[in-house]
Interface confidence: low
């Protein structure tokens, strides 16, 4: 039986395509090419005799078809017009004729896509975004990924308008990510460079560090305010309710029981229109014990069995208005997530004690003008024997 | 942190082909763009092509399409640049950087050391 | 693709003055209103370092006296007081659209 097949089915538009002629008969007299599902002499693209060898054209014939001696018909530079059904009619030399239909589909070579955005910089917990992939195309996939990634399951998402439009409902400052669209259909696929959004979030409660409530007199007062925001907030400073400067850092020389009080830090952001706030109390001490005692490493064991024991050591001093450090082998501790500090850093507790633990512990007891160190202490860890295996 | 290290300076003849590696550390390579950009002597820098590691897709600038081929071993966390048809036009430094949104917010903020490619008969 | 074209080629200032190096595009280079357009300072027998990434931020390590202004297609490179270690040669790049071209270079040197 007579067949056609198109070679390639689908075409990128532009290339060429090859209506490929199976089972043609023997003995023939000539044939020809027609536009659509069946013969229609308005719609001839090109008749051939096999005895001269001759092609003569058709009215459909645009000039980039060439028939070859086997049947077979080569269209180049194909466009999305020529999309569709192709039939051949066979003239055997009996004169019967015999016709096949086949079919090819043309298809854009796609551009680069982009992104564009109904809003550049929305407001967390209040904003929609809605990213639409550009352009717009027919029979083409819209595909999204989010940092390199498919886009996550996410009820604040969703895909509309045939997966061209990304909508990031209620975003959040998670959201910042680079999104890329990509588009595609059967013979060509492009990604657009990649979009990250901006998403304008707090501010949120402000921190104020040092943490210290408690002051020693002649101290240095460095108070640091920072809150999560994008854009980056405007600090201000209150104490006891009266305004002070517009800084992120407080700073006061040489305090007195003068400054007890509220402290209070306060953010906004302009782009979001939100505030926050906190405050802290500071106290200062009335005197200032300017030589520091020398501290005393008090342990509940010195000897223990590693993997197995724990141990507290404790740091006594006398004196108030300190801050207390501990080293181990001229190492800052804690140095693992065994080791924790409590009590204001007065005791050290080791759970469990391993190996590598063994060795000279010091405490350091600190104000503003002067510190001193305990005598350090030996820690000693011993293994028990493990059993022999049978 | 992030560590980029190239291979050794190469000399090489006319027409032969060069192949320069680039060992990411610190950072998994399939989370950005390798980016390979060029330095001849005296002269400014010159951006080359780029590869997606995680999928291996590449783009060169059309002034190297057809000799410059650039790859990426996700397994050893390597990136390569091949050059052929040498010229002597082709001596320069070339860098590779890491480029996207985890390592350098699409910027090239980490740069290997260079590797000095010498064409010379 | 986008062409940047850097000025002045040649800067000479002395250590302690402002030093401003201008970047102009071909064409926006502009991302939702952000500039895919940094700045790169290289001395010799160095790689490139980046100063500034997408238009005005500094990058980390980067001193203060180093800032970046600008959107579209015109932008600056700001040193408020030039250090003797700024003496070098500033590259910007555009990192909208392939290829990601860079300027040809600005020298700031000793006057």
């Known amino acids: 039986q007579l067949t056609t097949e198109s070679m390639p089915f689908n075409v990128a538009e532009g290339k060429e395509v090859l209506l490929l002629v199976h089972n043609l008969p023997q003995q023939l007299f000539g044939y020809s090419w027609y536009k659509g599902e069946r013969v229609d002499g308005n719609r001839q693209i090109v008749g051939y005799a096999i005895g001269t060898q001759q092609a003569t054209p058709g009215p459909a014939n645009s000039g980039r078809e060439t028939i070859y001696p086997n049947a077979s018909l080569l269209i180049q530079n194909v466009t999305q017009n020529d999309t569709g059904f192709y039939t051949l009619q066979v003239i055997k030399s009996d004169l019967v004729n015999e016709e096949a239909t086949g079919q090819f589909h043309v298809y854009p070579e796609l551009p680069k896509p982009s992104i564009s955005s109904n809003n550049s910089k929305p407001v967390e917990d209040k904003d929609a975004v809605a990213f639409t992939c550009e352009p717009e195309a027919q029979n083409t996939t819209y595909l999204w990924w989010v940092n390199g990634q498919s886009l996550p399951v996410s009820p604040r998402l969703q895909l509309s308008n045939g997966n061209r439009t990304l909508t990031l409902f209620n975003v959040t400052r998670n959201d910042a990510r680079a999104y890329v669209c990509g588009i595609q259909n059967s013979v060509s696929a492009n990604r657009s460079d990649p979009v990250t959004l901006d998403v304008l979030y707090g501010p949120d409660t402000p921190i104020i560090s040092p943490p210290d409530s408690s002051y020693l007199s002649g101290a240095n007062l460095n108070l640091s305010c920072h809150s999560a925001s994008n854009p980056s907030p405007q600090y201000s400073w209150r104490i006891n309710g009266i305004p002070q400067q517009h800084t992120q850092v407080l700073f006061i020389a040489k305090i007195t029981p003068n400054n007890n009080g509220t402290y209070a830090c306060f953010v906004s952001n302009l782009a979001t229109g939100r505030n926050n706030s906190i405050v802290k109390s500071i106290t200062v001490s009335a005197s200032l014990s300017p030589v520091v005692a020398k501290p005393q490493i008090k342990a509940s064991k010195t000897t223990v069995t590693g993997d197995k024991d724990s141990v507290n050591l404790t740091c006594s001093t006398n004196d108030t208005g300190i801050s207390i450090r501990w080293f181990f082998k001229n190492q800052s501790l804690p140095s693992s997530e065994r080791m924790k500090l409590s009590q204001g850093n007065i005791t050290l507790s080791i759970n469990p004690v391993k190996r590598e633990d063994a060795g000279t512990y010091w405490c350091e007891v600190f104000n503003p003008i002067s510190k001193n160190q305990s005598d350090p202490i030996m820690l000693n860890v011993n293994y028990n024997a493990l059993p022999q295996e049978n | 942190q992030v560590q980029l290290v190239q291979s050794g300076a190469e000399v090489k003849k006319p027409g032969s082909s060069v192949k320069v590696s680039c060992k990411a550390s610190?950072?998994?390579?399939?989370?950005?763009?390798m980016h390979w950009v060029r330095q001849a002597p005296g002269q400014g820098l010159e951006w080359m092509g780029r590869i997606d590691p995680a999928n291996g897709n590449s783009k060169y600038v059309p002034k190297f399409q057809g000799r410059v081929t650039i790859t990426a071993d996700t397994s050893t966390s390597t990136a390569y640049m091949e050059l052929s048809s040498l010229r002597s036009e082709d001596t320069a430094v070339y860098y590779c950087a890491p480029f996207g949104y985890y390592v350098s917010d699409y910027a090239m903020a980490y740069w290997g050391q260079g590797t000095l490619v010498t064409v010379s008969s | 693709e986008i062409v940047l074209t850097q000025s002045p080629a040649t800067l000479s200032l002395s250590p302690g003055e402002r030093a401003t190096l201008s970047c102009r595009a071909g064409?926006?280079?502009?991302?939702?209103?952000?500039?895919?357009l940094h700045w790169y300072q290289q001395k010799p027998g160095q790689a490139p370092r980046l100063l500034i990434y997408?238009?005005?931020n500094r990058a980390t390590g980067i001193p203060a006296r180093f800032s970046g202004s600008g959107s579209g297609t015109d932008f600056t490179l700001t040193i408020s007081s030039l250090e003797p270690e700024d003496f070098a040669v500033y590259y910007c790049q555009q990192t909208n659209e392939d290829p990601y071209t860079f300027g040809q270079g600005t020298k700031l040197e000793i006057k």
């Open positions: 997408r238009a005005s």
């Open positions: 610190g950072f998994n390579i399939k989370d950005t763009y």
């Open positions: 064409e926006s280079v502009d991302i939702f209103g952000v500039g895919f």
